[in-house]
Each structure stands twice: as C-alpha cells, then as structure tokens.
C-alpha cells in the first residue's frame, strides 16, 4: 500500500507585489492523522507560515475548505506579497502526536516576487558648468525585484554611451537597487536640452520609467560683450551700447566705468530670449563730449551668476568730432538704460 | 458507499478470531479504518487504527493482543487472547478522528467469547 | 490518556425543547478541536453529527450544532424531533494517534 506523498505541484511561482500567491499542496492520503504546516525556507530556522492545526494568520487563506472532509487540498494563498515574502514554501504533512512529528514534506514552490522599481530620480552636478565642460549626471531607482533590468540614457532623445551602472545587492536579496553614473558634454545649446534616464523592467509590461533633468538647472553660458558707439543724438553728446548677448542665466549685474570709475551699476531685467534658451540685454550710456578735456575711456563691465567679471572698452577721444570716431567690438547681452555724463 | 464487517462469531477464552470490514463504493488506500466495540448495553469503545503498515496503533489496553492490516478494499483486524470482557458487537468506520472523523460505519459484527 | 465525561447520562424531553448535552476533557483535545458528536439509535451503528467540535456532518440537520474549545464541548439540538430520540456519544481526541476515548454517553429519551 503506497504512503502518503505531499504533492507541490509549481516549481516556482512569480506574482507582482500587491498581489496574492497561490501556493499548491495536496497529500494523497489522509493517513496519518495530523495537521499540514507550510512553511519558508527549510532547517532549524524556517518560517512557520501556517498551521492547519493552531495559530493566526491573517495573511493566509485555505483554498479549499481545510475543514472538509476527505480534503486533500492544502493549497493555500498569501495576500498582498511583498518582496520580503520571496523564498521557497515547503507543504509538510505532521503526525498527530506529543509533539506533532514531521511526516513528510512536499518538494518546495520558490515564490518569486515581480516589484516595480521607484521612479528614477536624475541629479545632476551641485555648481554650473560651462559649455565644453564634462558633467556627471546620476539616476536612482529602487526596491525592484526581479535584479534584471534595463537602464539607458538619453539627451534630447539621443542615446548616451559614456555612463557606469550598478545593481545592489551582488547576491541573493528581496529588492534591488540600481544606481547609474553619465557623462555628458555641455554645448551652448543646451540650455532647452534635457537628460532622460530610462528603466525598463518586467513588471512594467514595457513601458519604462522615465526620470529627467534639465540641463538648464546645470549649465551657465557666459556672456559676449559688444560695445559700440552710436551716430550722435545731439550735439556734443554721443551714444555708446553695451550689447550683452547669449547668456544663461539671467542673473547679471552691469557696470559702466569711465576712466576707471564706476559711473552706473545696474541689474538686467528687460532681456530678451533667444530660441536657444539664452538671454540679450543691452545698456546704453549717453556721454556729453563737451564736458571732457581728455579722451575718455568707457567700460562695460558684466558680473554673470557670481562669476569673475568680464568687460569691454572703448575709447572715446574728445579731440576728434564725434562723426568720425569709430567703434569697438566687445560682447554680447541685452537690456536698455541712458545716462547722460556731464 | 459503505462497509460491512464479517467474522464475528462465538469464540472460547483465549481463542483469536479475524474480523473484516470491506469497503463497497470507495477505496480504504488513502483512509484509516478505525474500530471501535460495544459491550451489551454498555458505550462506545474506541480500540485502534489500521492505516497503512507503518501507521497502525491501539488503545494502551488492546495493545499486543489486537492487530491490524488492510488493503485497499479491506481491513481486518486479528483478535487474541480473547477473555469474556470482550463479547461486544465490533464496529468499523473510516477515519483516523480529528480532521478525518469516524464515517460511514459497518452495521456491526456480534463477537462473544464464551466456554 | 485523555478522558471524556459527558452529562447528563441521560434525559427526557419534548419534541421541540432545545437540548443541550456537554462533554469535559480531562486535558485539552488535540489542536483544542478533536472533539466528534456521534448518535446511535437501539441495533444500529453510530451516525456522525459533528467534527472539529462545530464543524457540521454532510447531510446532518442545521438543528444540531456543536461548539466549544479546549476541555469544554457542547452539542446543542435546538428543535428535538421525533427522531432525535437516540444516545449521544462525544468522541474526544488526545495528544497521541491512539488517543481517542468516548464520553459515557447521553440517553434523550421522550418526556
């Protein structure tokens, strides 16, 4: 007459997080008499899961009617699955006596746990960085299980090649984490671009997770400066500009000095916007050649976000009728001011 | 689905006797097969399970002089040493108690251990 | 071992009455629940009633049920019908295979 066998009939089992895991186990014999347990994992530290016998678990829930007669079915199921709840299950038939003796076991179900990753979280350097420069970016994501997964990178749509990533843990673990370094030159067209982190993993059905920084956060384009002198408004007096272009961003403070000395300081505000995503602003100066004996030189003089100052001159000679002065080149930026200079 | 037990009968003191009980409409193979007697006029007593070869016991009093096989459409059950305490109608069931209770029953078979 | 002691040993009542028949173990059943309610009528075998002290026997009326936990069981027949005239046995289950006695039964006979 054949003994009592513990069936299991799943190797493994995967379910999504959230979900429920049905577990199969049926004995083909009700002898002996004794409770079914279930358990995870196997040796001295197992995990009592459920005991037909005794206990509360409110997580557990019989298939079929336990109480029934002539049940064999011990199929049980595990509510709202966690990835801590990954291992392999073993049915184990006990003989009723003091204590219950384990009679024997099923072969075992692995339950695995399908967990989305976290959103990817981007982030970029802690200071701006100039055009031509080399920046780092990272991306996170987080508690994901299975440990295969798929992470790319993107600029404007373009992929990147230049980055580093890891999966944590090497071994065996409930979750997983994933954390990915890229390099990306900056242009002076970056200001619009953006930096795409994209994960792609079972449990999205192929549809990945996207997390994204503006390069606008991480870039700063520094100004040219261009100082020109304009025909005359009236007599005696001559016009010079200051043309700040293609800077981002906007935070800029402007300068004149004539002959060394500060004559005005001021704050872009009215710029204008590049299709680039920079800025113009141009300061005017109206100077009364009148009231100057000597050549006077002028200087514009522009603070970009904190940085060093750069500036452009121009040479205005007194001498001369102010028809024939030429004018000198400098850099770019816009914005409007007059002053005249007496 | 049910059982039937045979081979009771008058038996003198000290003599053995084999009882049956055949299962008609189920297979015993995944049951225990349980036996309990009954003196006249007196309650139910439970004597032991036949489960499979490793998986037979007995009540510490009918333990050495009751044993037990079974086959997967019949059990018996081997009594020796009889004495006159135990004339009682012999009953079998299917079921080892607790989760698998004793049903359905044999209608009863008469043993009487007389000189 | 185990014991069972069941009360009253015996009891008349009416068609109708509700009857309420005990069973004390002298420890606790296996699993606090091996605890079965058996009814024998004169010259027949025994029928169950009740297992795992509330669970209800395929076919058996919803008038008997059965409650209890532990060493402390009760079988409960709320409406008695002319057929329920019969004696009532608990069969308690203790910690080892063997271990199953019978309580020394209960008599409901007609008033």
């Known amino acids: 007459e054949e003994e009592l066998q513990v069936i299991q009939p799943d190797k493994s089992v995967s379910v999504a997080a959230g979900e429920s895991a049905i577990l199969h186990c049926t004995v083909t014999s009700l002898i002996p008499v004794g409770p079914i347990q279930w358990f995870r994992g196997a040796g001295p530290a197992r995990e009592l899961i459920y005991n037909q016998k005794e206990g509360h678990f409110p997580r557990v829930t019989t298939v079929s009617e336990s109480t029934k007669r002539e049940n064999m079915d011990f199929s049980i199921s595990i509510s709202n699955i966690t990835p801590a709840d990954a291992g392999t299950y073993y049915c184990v038939k006990f003989r009723k006596g003091s204590p219950d003796t384990e009679f024997k076991s099923g072969a075992g179900t692995e339950l695995s746990v399908r967990a989305k990753p976290s959103a990817p979280v981007v982030s970029g350097p802690a200071a701006r960085a100039t055009p031509q420069h080399t920046v780092s970016f990272t991306c996170e994501s987080h508690g994901f299980s299975p440990r295969d997964i798929t992470l790319k990178w993107f600029k404007n749509g373009n992929e990147l090649s230049d980055f580093q990533t890891n999966v944590d843990p090497v071994g065996e673990s409930v979750s997983y984490s994933i954390h990915s370094t890229a390099k990306v030159v900056l242009t002076r067209e970056d200001v619009h671009s953006q930096v795409i982190c994209e994960v792609a993993h079972v449990t999205l059905q192929g549809d990945p997770l996207r997390g994204t920084a503006n390069l606008s956060e991480t870039i700063r384009v520094p100004p040219t400066l261009e100082v020109t002198q304009q025909p005359v408004r009236a007599e005696n007096q001559v016009n010079v500009t200051c043309q700040v272009r293609k800077f981002y961003p906007q935070r800029l403070q402007l300068t004149w000095l004539e002959n060394g000395n500060v004559s005005r300081t001021e704050t872009a505000s009215t710029v204008t916007e590049n299709k680039d995503g920079t800025y113009n602003w141009m300061s005017w100066l109206l100077v009364n050649v009148s009231a100057h004996r000597d050549d006077v030189k002028l200087t514009c003089q522009v603070e970009h976000d904190g940085q060093p100052a750069v500036s452009k001159s121009h040479d205005l000679k007194v001498s001369a009728h102010p028809k024939e002065q030429g004018s000198n080149t400098a850099a770019e930026n816009t914005g409007s001011n007059e002053r005249n200079i007496y | 689905r049910q059982l039937v037990e045979s081979g009771g009968g008058l038996v003198q003191p000290g003599g053995s006797l084999r009882l049956s009980c055949t299962a008609s409409?189920?297979?015993?193979?995944?049951?225990?097969i349980s036996w309990v007697r009954q003196a006249p006029g007196k309650g139910l007593e439970y004597i032991g399970t036949?489960?499979?070869?490793?998986i037979t016991y007995f009540a510490s009093w009918a333990k050495g002089r009751f044993t037990g096989s079974k086959t997967s459409s019949t059990a018996y059950m081997e009594l020796s040493s009889l004495r006159s305490e135990d004339t009682a109608v012999y009953f079998c069931a299917r079921g080892s108690a607790w989760n698998d209770p004793f049903d359905p029953w044999g209608q009863g078979t008469l043993v009487t251990v007389s000189s | 071992a185990i014991q069972m002691t069941q009360s009253p040993s015996s009891l008349s009542a009416s068609v109708g009455d509700r009857v309420t028949i005990t069973c004390q173990a002298s420890q606790s059943v296996y699993g606090n629940n091996d605890l079965a309610w058996y009814q024998q009528k004169p010259g027949k075998a025994p029928k169950l009633l009740i297992y795992?002290?509330?669970t209800l026997a395929t076919g058996v009326p919803s008038r008997f049920s059965g409650s209890g936990s532990g060493t402390d069981f009760t079988l409960t027949i709320s409406s008695l019908q002319p057929e329920d005239f019969a004696t009532y046995y608990c069969?308690?289950?203790?910690?080892?295979?063997?271990?199953?006695?019978f309580g020394g039964g209960t008599k409901v006979e007609i008033k």
């Open positions: 409409g189920f297979s015993l193979s995944s049951h225990g």
């Open positions: 069969l308690g289950g203790g910690d080892d295979e063997a271990d199953n006695v």
């Open positions: 036949i489960g499979t070869g490793v």
């Open positions: 795992l002290a509330s």
